[in-house]
């Protein structure tokens, strides 16, 4: 049985190394991968109760308490 890297990461460990362009941060195993390897959410129909998620965070954006609406994967995680 193989454990993913996530199991080894402490809750208080520092944020991961930023991903290079064209890579996205895989939240489930906690490392950068080619963005094309990750499925992204379906677009929401007009009039949905919450904003349609974006497919990526821009490099100048950070993942924090205010980033909840950003869809993942997260390229260039700061």
């Amino acid at each position: 049985m193989r454990r993913g890297p996530r199991s080894l990461r402490g809750r208080d460990a520092p944020a991961p190394t930023p991903c290079v362009p064209a890579e996205c941060f895989d939240l489930l195993v906690r490392h950068c991968v080619a963005c094309g390897l990750l499925r992204t959410p379906r677009p929401k129909p007009a009039g949905a109760s919450s904003p349609a998620p974006r497919t990526a965070l821009q490099p100048q954006e950070s993942v924090g308490a205010g980033a909840g609406e950003a869809a993942l994967p997260l390229p260039g995680l700061l």
Partner: antibody, heavy 117, light 111 residues
């Protein structure tokens, strides 16, 4: 839209083996996470494990390495090999795929596995 | 493992009622400013259906009477006005830490 179709369920004797298949269409199993979840009769949901884009697998430790997930990318199908089956493994087995944060947005119809002598 | 405890285990309600289901995790399921908490609906003989992901995001095609809230260890699924098709069992799930775990379910029955 992703569609998932399970097959391979049925009746098996205790100690026996069974392989379930989940055929995916609408997306490649070389993208994302592809899971097995089971539900014993009248009980709740239990996550079995996943195989991801790279072929990495992870299992629920409660299954004690009796189950193995594999894939055939040429068939866009992934599998659950179940060995040393016990009566408590009797359940409907679902395959499902996830969004990047683990939420399972597409599910198969389920296949029933009955372990009984 | 993170234990997920739903309450109540079952409830009886009428069409038009506001229904609230809670889910408590044995430890925080937040990371990177995201709650790895999701809600599903399941009807007898059917596969579960994703309703809410990341604690509060409504899945595509799900009616807006469903909403989710919470962070850390305490989460809530609310149905603002119960409809006949909402009588089902509801499950929470965390994907913050392996192994991923579900709550035991809350059955919503007709009063």
């Amino acid at each position: 839209e992703v569609q998932l179709v399970e097959s391979g369920g049925g009746l098996v004797q205790p100690g026996g083996s069974l392989r379930l298949s989940c055929a995916a269409s609408g997306d490649s199993i070389t993208r994302g996470y592809w899971n097995w979840v089971r539900q014993a009769p009248g009980k709740g949901l239990e996550w079995v494990g996943y195989i991801n884009y790279s072929g990495t697998t992870y299992y629920n430790p409660s299954l004690k390495s009796r189950f193995t997930i594999s894939r055939d990318t040429s068939k866009n199908t992934f599998y659950l090999q179940m060995n040393s089956l016990r009566a408590e493994d009797t359940a409907v087995y679902y395959c499902a795929t996830t969004l990047p944060y683990g939420a399972m947005d597409y599910w198969g119809q389920g296949t029933l596995v009955t372990v009984s002598s | 493992d993170i234990q997920m405890t739903q309450s109540p285990s079952s409830l009886s309600a009428s069409v038009g009622d506001r229904v609230t289901i809670t889910c408590r995790a044995s430890e925080s399921v937040d990371d990177y400013g995201i709650s790895f908490m999701h809600w599903y609906q399941q009807k007898p003989g059917k596969a579960p259906k994703l309703l809410i992901y990341r604690a509060s995001d409504l899945e595509s095609g799900v009616p807006s009477r469903f909403s989710g809230s919470g962070s850390g260890t305490d989460f809530t699924l609310t149905i603002s006005s119960l409809q006949p098709e909402d009588f089902a069992t509801y499950y929470c799930q965390q994907t913050s830490k392996d192994p991923w775990t579900f709550g035991q379910g809350t059955k919503v029955e007709i009063k």
